[in-house]
Structure formats: structure tokens, C-alpha cells
């Protein structure tokens, strides 16, 4: 029979012939040959192949640098890579997470719409009208401002994006 | 196929490299170990080189050994200081936990 | 590394009689474990590989099993071509090392 020139899936052609992929967790060894199936073996401590492969070699699993402010957030198999993350207060400079920043606090004026994650830093948003912020905060929204009226009281300062309304006595009627 | 060269004759205390030659398969997708037998004896596994070119060894090994690809189609074993229980028949043979393609063998002996 | 151990050093059957060789490792090997043929002034020829599969050519009157640190080769119906030495080989992961059982004997009379 005419020698293959292609392959079927999880299948790789040497040598005129087509051999078996090795399967996730294993590296390619030796090629197959008309009297053996490809010799695969499996990745060490500490290594991974992720895909179908001939690989000679495994990958070796992401260090999660302590000194870059990352831990481990999931243990590396010899199927998958270790996923880094970054400890409380940090999150992650890129999706490889290869290194961590400080989250950002929001500076007054503007109130936190998405706490930050391992992985996304602080969302800030402008406080809209009827709402403050007077701190620098990783985790406060904007407060909405005081209701003078329900307190019995009348707005004796007017609010911004930064301050809370004042409040004060009404005035008595004079007889 | 894979063939053995360089066994012979040596003093103790002399070193000595045997070659691999391998045709038909490529040594840069496929590993080579190095075995070798005493006479009336059983097999021995020395150690591997990888298609990467890593070389792993026995622990017994480790130290007296030393493997590597010297062109593209041979592989050598490289002996430092031998003694008379090196006296052997070498093989190196295709393959890394199991071996399908084995050379006939060079015999080393060491004697005085 | 793993240590294979190989029973029994010597076995005689008459032709048509059954051989079982039983090779132990000193640590679990998963099924990474070969076994070998070898004839006097010959090479070792391969037999079996990932514990019990047959190398293209091999008389399917050789079946080999086991996984962990148990495994065994079982030669029927034997012929006198089967008289030789019996190897096992087994893979140590955790350093990336080989090792071959001490080998069984087979006499065929």
C-alpha cells in the first residue's frame, strides 16, 4: 500500500508512517514502528504536557514567586500548568500573572464599582449627584448624601461628589 | 538498526568510548540506553540520552559513565576508569523504558 | 531506584507445558514494565511492552499482566525455540531510570 501522507487525529507522521501523539501528562520517548506503538512516558515532579504531543520534553509547571507577591492558586498536575494568583490586597499585572500590583484605592470623588480579584484591580466610578466619597478606598462605594428631610432638618450646606450635605435646624417662623 | 563499535582489550584504570551508530530512525525523536551484561551474568541498564540530549543514569552508574550524541546518527558511551567488573558485553539499544531495536553488542574486557 | 525482582532463577517444563514468571517491583511502576527474550550469544529480543502488550511478531502463546509492583509472564503450549533466558524491565518515573529483573531460565524438555 502507498505510504500515508496525512494522519488522522492524535496521529503524527514519521518515517512514512503514522504514530500515535502521546497523551496529556506524557512525553514523546521513541517513535512508533511497524512492531511497537510510540514509546510515551510520563511527565515528572513538577513538569506538565497539556495536549496530545511529541514533546520530548515536558514543560516545567509556573513558580509562584512569593517575592513577586503571587501564591499558588491551583497545584500544577502533570496534565496542567500551576495557576498563580496574587495575596490579599494584590492583583495580577497581566493574564500570565507573571507579577502583582497593590490594588488601587478610588481617591475621594470617586466610590468603588468592582472590588479587585486576584486577577482585576479596583473599578472606580465618579460618584454621581446625590452621592460622596471623602476617602481614599480599595473598598468603599459612594454614599449617598444625608436626607436632611427625613431627619426632620433642612440642608444647610449643599453636597458634591466629595462632601455630604449639612444639615440643619429649620427656621421658626416668627409670629 | 543499531550498531556497537569500540569494545577491545584494556588495562585497568583505562578509559574507553564505545559508539552507537543508529539508521532508520533519528536520534531527534528517539532515546538510546546503553545496557550491558557480564559474562554468564544478567542485564544491566546503565543510562539513557533523551532526544533532547538529557542523559539519566542508574545510581550505580552516576560518576563512572558518561553519554552523548556525537553527530547525528551516533551516540557514545563514555567510560572513565574501569575495572575488572566492567569486563562486559555492551549493548545500546533503541528506546528508554522498553527497547525494541538492540546492536549484536562490542565486548569490553579489563584485565591485567 | 527500582529494584525488579524476578522468580523463579530457573524453570523446566516438557513441550506443550506452561511457564509462569513472575516479576516484582520495589515500588509502584504503574504499567511501565517489559519483558524480554534472550538467546545465548544473541541480543535481548523484545516480547512485551506496557506490562501486556504484544510486540508485533510475538507468538500470542506469551500473555504478560499486572500493574503496580506486580506482574507476570505466562509462556503456553511450549516449544523447544522457547528455551532461553527471560528478562523483566521496569521504569522507575521518579528518577527516570530503567532496571532489568536477575532473568528466569527456561528449559524445554
Known amino acids: 500500500p502507498e505510504p500515508p501522507t496525512a494522519c488522522r487525529e492524535k496521529q503524527y507522521l514519521i518515517n512514512s508512517q503514522c504514530c500515535s501523539l502521546c497523551q496529556p501528562g506524557q512525553k514523546l520517548v521513541s517513535d512508533c514502528t511497524e512492531f511497537t506503538e510510540t514509546e510515551c512516558l510520563p511527565c515528572g515532579e513538577s513538569e506538565f504536557l497539556d495536549t496530545w504531543n511529541r514533546e520530548t520534553h515536558c514543560h516545567q509547571h509556573k513558580y509562584c514567586d512569593p517575592n513577586l507577591g503571587l501564591r499558588v492558586q491551583q497545584k500544577g498536575t502533570s496534565e496542567t500548568d500551576t495557576i498563580c494568583t496574587c495575596e490579599e490586597g494584590w492583583h495580577c499585572t497581566s493574564e500570565a500573572c507573571e507579577s502583582c500590583v497593590l490594588h488601587r484605592s478610588c481617591s475621594p470623588g470617586f466610590g468603588v464599582k468592582q472590588i479587585a480579584t486576584g486577577v482585576s484591580d479596583t473599578i472606580c466610578e465618579p460618584c454621581p449627584v446625590g452621592f460622596f466619597s471623602n476617602v481614599s478606598s480599595a473598598f468603599e462605594k459612594c454614599h449617598p448624601w444625608t436626607s436632611c428631610e427625613t431627619k426632620d432638618l433642612v440642608v444647610q450646606q449643599a453636597g458634591t461628589n466629595k462632601t455630604d450635605v449639612v444639615c440643619g435646624p429649620q427656621d421658626r417662623l416668627r409670629a | 538498526s543499531v550498531e556497537e563499535s569500540g569494545g577491545r582489550l584494556v588495562t585497568p584504570g583505562t578509559p574507553l568510548t564505545l559508539t552507537c551508530t543508529v539508521s532508520?530512525?533519528?536520534?531527534?525523536?528517539?532515546?538510546i540506553s546503553w545496557v550491558r551484561q557480564a559474562p554468564g551474568k544478567g542485564l544491566e541498564w546503565i543510562g539513557v540520552?533523551?532526544?533532547?540530549?538529557?542523559t539519566y543514569f542508574a545510581s550505580w552508574a552516576k560518576g563512572l559513565f558518561t553519554i552523548s550524541k556525537t553527530s547525528s546518527t551516533t551516540v557514545d558511551l563514555q567510560m572513565t576508569s574501569l575495572t575488572t567488573e566492567d569486563t562486559a558485553t555492551y549493548f545500546c539499544?533503541?528506546?528508554?523504558?522498553?527497547?525494541?531495536?538492540w546492536g549484536p553488542g562490542t565486548l569490553v574486557t579489563v584485565s591485567s | 531506584d527500582v529494584v525488579m525482582t524476578q522468580t523463579p532463577a530457573s524453570v523446566s517444563e516438557p513441550v506443550g507445558g506452561t511457564v509462569t514468571i513472575k516479576c516484582q517491583a520495589s515500588?509502584?511502576?504503574?504499567?511501565?514494565l517489559a519483558w524480554y527474550q534472550q538467546k545465548p550469544g544473541q541480543p535481548p529480543r523484545l516480547l512485551i511492552y506496557?506490562?501486556?502488550t504484544l510486540a508485533s511478531g510475538v507468538s500470542s502463546r506469551f500473555k504478560a499482566s499486572g500493574s503496580g509492583t506486580e506482574f507476570t509472564l505466562t509462556i503456553s503450549d511450549l516449544e523447544c525455540a522457547d528455551a532461553a533466558t527471560y528478562y523483566c524491565?521496569?521504569?522507575?518515573?521518579?528518577?527516570?531510570?530503567?532496571?532489568f529483573g536477575g532473568g528466569t531460565e527456561v528449559v524445554v524438555k
Open positions: 540520552i533523551d532526544a533532547g540530549g538529557s
Open positions: 515500588q509502584s511502576i504503574s504499567n511501565i
Open positions: 506496557s506490562a501486556s
Open positions: 539499544a533503541r528506546g528508554w523504558s522498553r527497547h525494541d531495536f
Open positions: 524491565q521496569g521504569y522507575d518515573s521518579t528518577v527516570g531510570v530503567g532496571a
Open positions: 532508520g530512525f533519528s536520534l531527534s525523536s528517539n532515546a
